[in-house]
């Protein structure tokens, strides 16, 4: 990526890292308003299986691994990107490396959920306080999960699907910060590991993933009021290890792996019409990206 100053624009969809033949250091941003891509400052270390989030207008890249011809190293790193300066800076590392991690943000704190270190599949969860640059462990999940989808709704943290080291999962659980405890919620209709999970209009969406046999294009959403999962329109492409985010009331899914090809496809879901459309392509196909949207 270029090292010049990033243009001062509104809400962008950032995609960091990923995998194609090896872990990638790209940081690119898509502007849905004009369909353009920006090439931004590279990650300091290539990584895939990371997660992205935004706190206080800063983009954070969390965990993952550097899978390169020289070796394979799981990451405990937390790195912070400032869109105003187009620069990355390291923050305090997590207590353990977490590849194929999930993250969520509650009250300005980043929760790092699950992931793997070698063949250890974590159920542990830790919380980062940006103002102190500190991580602290919180209650562990009831289930070990890598490739876990994480979303926050009504100040509750949801961990959805994943892989426990033996089985891909359709189970999901919810963390209550005030009680520091996890509780199981209704399981999905479909086993999904490496799904894209996000929140839109008071529902949790789980898109794609891998069921232990095949990549999926199906999408389902969880209504917290009725505690039920319901299918919505499927994506055009089967994909696992995809990136996902919400921008102006629409869901965007980025890249992933379809069992044969690393996808460059970006699809957008409109909940009003229950339809998916191809909106753009990434500059190259990749899986295992970290995705987040800048705040207004």
């Amino acid at each position: 990526g270029s090292m010049g100053h990033a243009p001062k624009v509104g809400r962008l969809i950032y995609t960091a890292g990923g995998y194609f033949r090896q872990s990638l250091s790209y940081l690119e941003a898509y502007n849905p308003s004009d369909g353009t891509w920006l090439d931004l400052a590279d990650l300091q270390v290539p990584r895939s299986g990371l997660a992205g989030c935004v706190v206080g207008g800063l983009l954070y890249a969390v965990g993952g691994r550097n899978n390169s011809p020289d070796g394979n190293t799981d990451s405990s790193a937390l790195d912070c990107y400032n869109p105003m300066t187009n620069q990355w800076s390291p923050c305090a590392p997590m207590s353990v490396p977490r590849n194929r991690i999930g993250v969520g943000v509650i009250d300005g704190h980043i929760y790092a959920v699950g992931g793997s270190h070698g063949c250890i599949h974590h159920n542990s969860v830790e919380r980062y306080e940006p103002e102190r640059d500190e991580w602290h462990l919180v209650a562990p999940m009831l289930t070990r999960r890598i490739g876990v989808g994480v979303a926050v709704l009504n100040r509750l943290l949801y961990a959805v699907g994943g892989f426990d080291g033996t089985n891909r999962l359709n189970s999901a659980e919810c963390y209550y910060p005030e009680r520091n405890e996890w509780r199981m919620i209704t399981a999905m209709n479909t086993i999904r590991s490496g799904a894209g999970v996000c929140v839109l209009h008071n529902c949790i969406y789980a898109a794609g993933g891998y069921d232990g046999q095949d990549q999926l294009n199906s999408v389902e959403r969880y209504d917290v009021e009725t505690e039920t999962w319901t299918f919505v329109a499927p994506m055009k492409h089967r994909r696992s290890a995809l990136g996902i985010t919400v921008h102006q009331g629409r869901i965007y899914v980025l890249g992933g792996y379809d069992g044969h090809t690393f996808l460059d496809s970006v699809e957008c879901y409109d909940p009003d019409t229950d339809t998916w459309s191809e909106v753009t392509r990434m500059t190259s196909g990749r899986s295992g990206v970290g995705v987040a949207v800048t705040m207004e």
């Epitope: 899978n67 194929r100 070698g118 599949h121 490496g194 232990g212 046999q213 990549q215 690393f262």
Partner: antibody, heavy 119, light 107 residues
């Protein structure tokens, strides 16, 4: 019955290339991480490469990184090992194996295919 | 890389004997160790995974155990078809590595 069948081995000159295939029947290669393991004549087992069915990520032993490429075609239920810039020390029987659990061993193995690198 | 040091490299035993083979990991590998049996000209066969779990279809005379970084394969009563070479493998850390093998021969 679960079966993996390798093919594509043979005699090749140093610097040459070969592509090994591993055709699965009785199970889907997409349901397992696929590994290639080799065994030089009279020697022990050496892990070579693997591909993750969920992310597409590949891993390689240092001895083959940059020269070998593992891939899978789920529509053909077949995995491949493309071997370039072959060296005499790559001479071995090459096995493909399916590993179903992170902490497990490889429960399904092919019969092996011999690759001989010699001038 | 993690080294898996297997001992002995060979042993002679009789049918009915109790046989023990050990693998020592150069660093912690948790329980991510498998054991294989290989006969000449054949592919390896999985016996034990996760250090002590018996793979489907494997006779119960085979067992595995772990003590720290030491892993043991035990054959409680050696049968004629058990004469073969045995390998341990760690899958805890990249790259996966094998022990050098133990050849079990007829006394």
């Amino acid at each position: 019955e679960v079966q993996l069948v390798e093919s594509g081995g043979g005699l090749v000159q140093p610097g040459g290339s070969l592509r090994l295939s591993c055709a699965a029947s009785g199970f889907a290669i997409s349901a397992s991480s696929i590994h290639w393991v080799r065994q030089a004549p009279g020697k022990g087992l050496e892990w070579v490469a693997s591909i993750d069915p969920e992310t597409g990520e590949t891993l390689y032993a240092k001895s083959v990184a940059g020269r070998f490429t593992i891939s899978a075609d789920t529509s053909k239920n077949t995995a491949y090992l493309q071997m370039n810039s072959l060296r005499a020390e790559d001479t071995a029987v090459y096995y493909c194996a399916g590993l179903l659990w992170s902490w497990g061993g490889a429960g399904s193995w092919g019969q092996g295919t011999l690759v001989t690198v010699s001038s | 890389d993690i080294q898996m040091t297997q001992s002995p490299s060979s042993l002679s035993a009789s049918v009915g004997d109790r046989v023990t083979i050990t693998c020592r990991a150069s660093q912690s590998v948790s329980s991510a160790v498998a054991w294989y049996q290989q006969k000449p000209g054949k592919a390896p066969k999985l016996l034990i995974y996760s250090a002590s779990s018996l793979y489907s279809g494997v006779p119960s005379r085979f067992s595995g155990s772990r003590s720290g970084t030491d892993f043991t394969l035990t054959i409680s009563s050696l049968q004629p078809e058990d004469f073969a070479t045995y390998y341990c493998q760690q899958s805890y850390s990249f790259p996966s590595t094998f022990g050098q093998g133990t050849k079990v021969e007829i006394k």
